[in-house]
C-alpha cells in the first residue's frame, strides 16, 4: 500500500529573467527513493538517480541546475516557462509518487514573493 505523500511548493510566481527553485518532499513512507524525475508538460528536464547522481536533459543544460537537495533550479526565466511542473518520485517498493507545481513567470517586477523555496 502506498502511504507516502508529496509536499510541493504549490503555485509560485517569479519574474522574467530571474530564477526559481522547484521543491518537492516525500514523507510518510519508508520506501527507498531510487530516482526523481522533473518534468515540464511533455518534456523531461532532469533526473536525480540514487546510484548515478544528477543528469540534466541536454536541451535544458544552459538553464537548469540541480538542487538544492532533490529540487531543481530554473534560471533565466522566460514567459514561456509558465506552466505545470511535475516531480516524479520512483520508489521501492511503493512505486511512483507525483507532485505538481504551477509556475507563473511575470513580465513586470511585481511578482509575488510569498512562496516558499523561492530565490529572492
Amino acid at each position: 500500500m502506498m502511504t507516502g505523500t508529496i509536499e510541493t511548493t504549490g503555485n509560485i510566481s517569479a519574474e522574467k529573467g530571474g530564477s526559481i527553485i522547484l521543491q518537492c518532499h516525500l514523507s510518510s513512507t519508508t520506501a527507498q527513493v531510487t530516482q526523481v524525475n522533473w518534468e515540464q508538460q511533455d518534456q523531461l528536464l532532469a533526473i536525480c538517480n540514487a546510484d548515478l547522481g544528477w543528469h540534466i536533459s541536454p536541451s535544458f543544460k544552459d538553464r537548469v541546475a540541480p538542487g538544492p537537495g532533490l529540487g531543481l533550479t530554473l534560471q533565466s526565466l522566460t514567459v514561456n516557462d509558465t506552466g505545470e511542473y511535475f516531480c516524479i518520485y520512483h520508489t521501492y517498493p511503493d512505486g511512483t509518487y507525483t507532485g505538481r507545481i504551477f509556475l507563473e513567470v511575470l513580465e513586470s517586477s511585481v511578482a509575488e514573493h510569498g512562496a516558499r523555496f523561492q530565490i529572492p
Epitope: N37, L44, I47
Partner: antibody
C-alpha cells in the same frame, strides 16, 4: 576524437566468468556514464547496467544482479564488465557505450563472447 | 520494467520514399526516448535523442516525434545507406529498455 576500444573475443565454458574491458579516450572519463549493452544472436539490444566513473555508482538490470559487476579505473580511463556463472544464453556481442543518461553517443566496437562446452 | 514495443518488425520502402517506424512505451516516459541505427557488423549509432532532437552529424532526413507513450522515427527520403535495424530506447528510468527493432530494407 572520442573512442571506446573493447577487449577481444572470448570463448568460455558454462559456469565460468568473463571480464570485458572498455578503454576510453578523447574526453574526460569521469564526466560521462559508461553503459553496457549486449545483443544475443537474433535478439534485440539489451541494456545490462551502467557506472558513473566519477562516483563509482552503479545500476544494474535486475536479471543480472548478483551475476554482473561493472567497475571503472579512473587512472587508465577503462571500464570493465564482469559476468559470472555463464550459460549458453549469455553468448552475445557485448558493447560499452558512453552515456549522457539521456542517450548513448559513442559505442565500442563490440566484444563477442561465446559460451560453449 | 518499461516495455518498448516497435512496429512494424520489418519495412520495405522504395528509394526516395518515406519510412515510418513506431514505438510504444508500456507507461509514460515523457520525451525520454532515443533512436539508434544498427548495421550488421557495426556498433549502433545514435540518431535522435529526447524524442525529437537530431544528434550531431545525422542527416536531416531523419526526424523523431512523440511524447508520453507514443513515438515515431521518420526517414523522409530513404537512401541505400539507410538499410539497417532501427531501435528505440527509453531513458526515463532504469533499466533503459530497447524496443525489438525494425528492419528497414529497399523495396
Amino acid at each position: 576524437e572520442v573512442q571506446l576500444v573493447q577487449s577481444g573475443a572470448e570463448v568460455k565454458k558454462p559456469g565460468a566468468s568473463v571480464k570485458v574491458s572498455c578503454k576510453a579516450s578523447g574526453y574526460a572519463f569521469t564526466n560521462y556514464l559508461i553503459e553496457w549493452v549486449r545483443q544475443a544472436p537474433g535478439q534485440r539490444l539489451e541494456w545490462m547496467g551502467v557506472i558513473n566513473p566519477g562516483s563509482g555508482g552503479t545500476n544494474y538490470k535486475e536479471k543480472f544482479k548478483g551475476r554482473v559487476t561493472i567497475t571503472a579505473d579512473k587512472s587508465s580511463s577503462t571500464a570493465y564488465m564482469e559476468l559470472s556463472s555463464l550459460r549458453s544464453e549469455d553468448t552475445a556481442v557485448y558493447y560499452c557505450a558512453r552515456g549522457e543518461y539521456f542517450f548513448f553517443d559513442y559505442w565500442g566496437q563490440g566484444t563477442t563472447v561465446t559460451v560453449s562446452s | 520494467d518499461i516495455v518498448m514495443t516497435q512496429s512494424p518488425d520489418s519495412l520495405a520502402v522504395s528509394l526516395g520514399e518515406r519510412a515510418t517506424i513506431n514505438c510504444k512505451a508500456s507507461q509514460h516516459v515523457s520525451n525520454a526516448v532515443a533512436w539508434y541505427q544498427h548495421k550488421p557488423g557495426q556498433s549502433p549509432k545514435l540518431l535522435i535523442y529526447s524524442a525529437s532532437y537530431r544528434y550531431t552529424g545525422v542527416p536531416d532526413r531523419f526526424s523523431g516525434s512523440g511524447s508520453g507513450t507514443d513515438f515515431t522515427l521518420t526517414i523522409s527520403s530513404l537512401q541505400a545507406e539507410d538499410v539497417a535495424v532501427y531501435y528505440c530506447q527509453q531513458h526515463y528510468n532504469t533499466p533503459h529498455t530497447f524496443g525489438g527493432g525494425t528492419k528497414v530494407e529497399i523495396k
